[in-house]
């Protein structure tokens, strides 16, 4: 029962995580115009992985796609790639994990197959989560670097008489969505891997018991049964369990509050 719960919970957590990764990838607010210690403009700029947007004071919003591949920074391309890989792996993982769920019976699928599928999906979720976290972190690092570079430019003397407004960008909502979603996918994957251990069929070994029939000295050595009903008293055979003690890890994530301008 605990195994089914762990597997089910892992699936749900991963599902939420992957939905979050997809949402973050599609969101336009990966970076938003820094409003602190900046000239107050009548427009608000924000950028995503696929397009940049401007919201005017009237509420009118205009977005322009990045209609170039070669002209984009390599880091942005890398972030896009990481997020897409994360989504693809997560989607495949979800598909695999649906068939691996203990509560769903598909034909005569054995528990060993379900265990393998659970492990596979768990690993996929872990890698998917890591991809998302890596992608978001690379973008965040890029933002921090650019932020301090543009801050330095703001306070150094301008060459000519004409000044240009240096728009600085800070962390957008998509980054936090991405981090949380990646973390959830990772946790879900870990839970699936834990559930896999519980799903693995128990190799039941029986000690050889010799039966002494009267007048004959023949020893019967019955082989270990793969499955046992578990009912009735077993006086003749002493059952030995391999790895009988199993622990289930309870993974708890504590949300962190990020204050940003």
């Amino acid at each position: 029962m605990a195994v089914t719960a762990c597997q089910g919970l892992g699936f749900v957590v991963s599902l939420i995580g992957i939905a979050g990764i997809i949402a973050a990838t599609c969101m336009d607010q990966w970076s938003t115009q820094d409003l602190y210690n900046n000239p107050v403009t009548a427009v608000f700029n924000y950028q995503g992985l696929w397009r940049s947007c401007v919201r005017e004071s009237s509420g009118f919003t205009e977005c322009r796609g990045y209609f170039t591949l070669l002209g984009l920074p390599a880091m942005l391309q890398a972030v896009r790639a990481l997020m897409i890989v994360g989504i693809v792996l997560g989607a495949i993982g979800l598909l695999v994990s649906i068939f691996a769920l203990k509560c769903i019976r598909i034909g005569s699928m054995e528990d060993s197959a379900k265990a393998n599928m659970t492990l596979t999906s768990g690993i996929m979720f872990i890698v998917s989560g890591l991809c998302a976290i890596a992608g978001v972190s690379v973008f965040a690092n890029m933002l921090v670097t650019n932020f301090w570079m543009s801050t330095a430019n703001m306070y150094t003397g301008m060459g000519g008489m004409v000044q240009t407004v240096q728009t600085r960008y800070t962390f957008g909502a998509a980054l936090f969505v991405g981090w949380v979603a990646g973390g959830l996918t990772l946790i879900g994957g870990v839970m699936m891997c834990i559930a896999c251990r519980g799903l693995a069929p128990e190799e039941t070994n029986y000690k050889a018991v010799s039966y002494h029939a009267s007048g004959h000295s023949v020893a019967y050595k019955p082989g270990g049964f793969k499955a046992s009903t578990g009912f009735g008293s077993n006086t003749k055979n002493k059952k030995i369990y391999d790895g009988g003690a199993r622990t289930e890890d309870e993974v708890q994530s504590y949300p962190s509050k990020h204050d940003y301008v």
């Epitope: 000239p39 403009t41 009548a42 009118f60 205009e62 322009r64 000044q163 240009t164």
Partner: antibody
Framework: EVQLVESGGGLVQPGGSLRLSCAVS????????MHWVRQAPGKGLEWVAY????????YYADSVKGRFTVSRDNAKNSLYLQMNSLRAEDTAVYYC????????????WGQGTLVTVSS | DIVMTQSPDSLAVSLGERVTMNCKSS????????????LTWYQQKPGQPPKLLIY???TRESGVPDRFSGSGSGTDFTLTISSVQAEDVAVYYC?????????FGQGTKLEIK
């Protein structure tokens, strides 16, 4: 038809106060930011203040900061400008202006109300 | 604050003539996010409130005759009237609508010879 009608102007002594009102009709007032712009007799235009549709953003010209207060009542379709510590240089025609949907432009202007600060 | 400087202060032209007036800002009014310039042109006829002519430096407001056109980017902008009509006699103002406080140029007065 968009209409902006200013009222409340008049003669006031230096150091005195005045409250201008702007009654709006012909558009959804609560959806648009609003400006006050003034023009001294025979002079050019001077932007005075801006208030966003939801009153979250309010900006003033340096020359009026701390003395003038812009406010709005979306339920009454009205814009206000409270002017305190008035000076002779505040003498002007005050226009109530709608902030345009595109380009942050000032697209519709009222006829203006004259404020004269003199002793 | 951004300083807007218009030139010339006034000009007198004949009917049907082409006229250009300039506006220079002390800071760039170009927003890289949407590749637009936040400069607006207004026309003020005697005894009337100003009227919006052009926004985004080059986009004509609806109802404005196509003889009016705006151009320029960054800090240098131009308003052109391709064929001046009698009703174009007015003062023309440019305005920074990018950075608060919003600022106007001192105006260019257009007269007919």
């Amino acid at each position: 038809e968009v209409q902006l009608v200013e009222s409340g102007g008049g003669l006031v002594q230096p150091g005195g106060s005045l409250r201008l009102s702007c009654a709006v009709s012909g558009f959804t007032f609560s959806s648009f930011g609003m400006h006050w712009v003034r023009q001294a007799p025979g002079k050019g235009l001077e932007w005075v203040a801006y208030i966003s549709s939801g009153t979250t953003n309010i900006y003033y010209a340096d020359s009026v900061k701390g003395r003038f207060t812009v406010s709005r009542d979306n339920a009454k379709n009205s814009l206000y400008l409270q002017m305190n510590s008035l000076r002779a240089e505040d003498t002007a025609v005050y226009y109530c202006v709608r902030s345009g949907y595109y380009g942050s432009s000032l697209d519709y202007w009222g006829q203006g109300t004259l404020v004269t600060v003199s002793s | 604050d951004i300083v807007m400087t218009q030139s010339p202060d006034s000009l007198a032209v004949s009917l049907g003539e082409r006229v250009t007036m300039n506006c220079k800002s002390s800071q760039s009014l170009f927003n890289s996010g949407n590749q637009r310039n936040y400069l607006t042109w207004y026309q003020q006829k005697p005894g009337q409130p100003p009227k919006l002519l052009i926004y985004w430096a080059s986009t004509r407001e609806s109802g404005v005759p196509d003889r009016f056109s705006g151009s320029g980017s960054g800090t240098d902008f131009t308003l052109t009237i391709s064929s001046v009509q009698a009703e174009d006699v007015a003062v023309y103002y440019c305005q920074n609508v990018y950075i608060y406080p919003l600022t106007f140029g001192q105006g260019t007065k257009l007269e007919i010879k």
